[in-house]
């Protein structure tokens, strides 16, 4: 009686069970009644990672750098290149298929939160009393500077991408 | 030689449901996603949402209380199912590898008209 | 929700023009841009990831720059196979993933 279901790393093929390949291994050629599995090792700069009835491996994923990507495990005949973001870049999703530069918080913006590997850079507007008059992916926003400390008097007011300027106090004429 | 093909039903009645399948090969879905995107006759392409290679499945916002993207990795497939077609839903729906990321891959696509 | 406005929706050029397609993004996406070239009939085709980085096997008579929501796709010198519509997509996030309307370059 031929079989209808095969044990686990077996499949089913002409009304026979076959042992599957081990990962690192493709299909050369399937069993017969007298000869067993035949597989042959993934080559160089290819995979897979089950056991499986594969007649060809995968080729390893490519972290491509014009997508920000670079390698952060090297794969092996049974396992996929791993790839990561360079430093600077982030994940634009949790698969990271691919990285893009973090942003710069623009000009009346600070930096809330600096960005990760998989998160992006955290802008917040600059409050009343404090500037950024550049566009980072690191600073914050700075407070006005204090003219009364210096013994000097506000000449102009601040903004949120400007700070005040101090001008010495008006003497009084005699 | 890594490929993707659609594969499905040309024609759809509306308010029907559309199921359409993405065969990969030559690379495992464990490495990389699938994305859906179509193009109405003569319009612009449009992206509908993809699963990424951790099996995680993104929406178009617009499309997202229509869509389900699954994928069986044994199978080596992504199904896309979308509810509700309405005769605006025709389209060519291409599937590419990739998640949220660019598409250097793209199948041939499939032409689906909706229509009674 | 998240748009990008490409412009011109058409241009007429002649083999030889130095060609400029445009494409906004109502938000920054840093450097989170794709071109593609699509032929009647055909999938589209990458041309340019990463907002100025080209695709394996492209022409450099094709570059693409900006930053941020501004950004540009040029052809320097237009070869009778560059006739076709070319898209920008987004890739900076799930929430922003989203192809430009189209620009279709025609022969003068």
């Known amino acids: 009686e031929p079989p209808t279901a095969c044990r686990e790393k077996q499949y089913l093929i002409n009304s026979q069970c076959c042992s599957l390949c081990q990962p690192g291994q493709k299909l050369v050629s399937d069993c017969t009644e007298f000869t067993e599995t035949e597989c042959l090792p993934c080559g160089e700069s290819e995979f897979l990672d089950t056991w499986n009835r594969e007649t060809h491996c995968h080729q390893h994923k490519y972290c491509d750098p014009n997508l920000g990507l670079r390698v952060q495990q090297k794969g092996t005949s049974e396992t996929d290149t791993i790839c990561t973001c360079e430093e600077g870049w982030h994940c634009t999703s949790e698969a990271c298929e691919s990285c893009v530069l973090h942003r710069s918080c623009s000009p009346g913006f600070g930096v809330k939160q600096i960005a990760t590997g998989v998160s992006d850079t955290i802008c917040e507007p600059c409050p009343v009393g404090f500037f950024s008059n550049v566009s980072s992916a690191f600073e914050k926003c700075h407070p006005w500077t204090s003219c009364e400390t210096k013994d000097l008097v506000v000449q102009q007011a601040g903004t949120n991408k400007t700070d005040v300027v101090c001008g010495p106090q008006d003497r009084l004429r005699a | 030689e890594v490929t993707v093909k659609e594969s499905g039903p040309v024609l759809v009645k509306p308010t029907e449901t559309l199921t359409l399948t993405c065969t990969v090969s030559?690379?495992?879905?464990?490495?990389?996603?699938v994305s859906w995107i179509r193009q109405p006759p003569g319009k612009a392409l449009e992206w509908l949402g993809g699963?990424?290679?951790?099996?995680?499945?993104y929406y178009a916002s617009w499309a997202k209380s229509r869509l389900t993207i699954s994928r069986d990795t044994n199978l080596k497939q992504v199904v896309l199912t979308m509810t509700n077609m309405d005769p605006v839903d025709t389209a060519t729906y291409y599937c590419?590898?990739?998640?949220?990321?660019?598409?250097?891959?793209w199948g041939q696509g499939t032409l689906v008209t909706v229509s009674s | 929700a998240f748009q990008l406005t490409q412009s011109p929706s058409s241009l007429s050029a002649s083999v030889g023009d130095r060609v400029t397609i445009t494409c906004q993004a109502s938000?920054?996406?840093?450097?989170?841009l794709a071109w593609y070239q699509q032929k009647p009939g055909k999938p589209p085709k990458l041309l340019i990831v990463?907002?100025?980085n080209l695709a394996s096997g492209v022409p450099s008579r094709f570059s693409g720059s900006g930053s941020g929501t501004d950004f540009t796709l040029t052809i320097s010198s237009l070869q009778p196979e560059d006739f076709a519509t070319y898209y920008c997509?987004?890739?900076?996030?799930?929430?922003?993933?989203?192809f430009g309307g189209g620009t279709k370059v025609e022969i003068k």
């Open positions: 030559g690379f495992s879905l464990s490495s990389y996603g």
């Open positions: 590419a590898r990739g998640g949220i990321t660019v598409y250097a891959m």
């Open positions: 997509q987004s890739y900076f996030s799930s929430s922003s993933t989203v």
């Open positions: 938000q920054s996406i840093s450097s989170g």
């Open positions: 699963i990424g290679s951790d099996g995680s499945a």
């Open positions: 990463g907002a100025s």
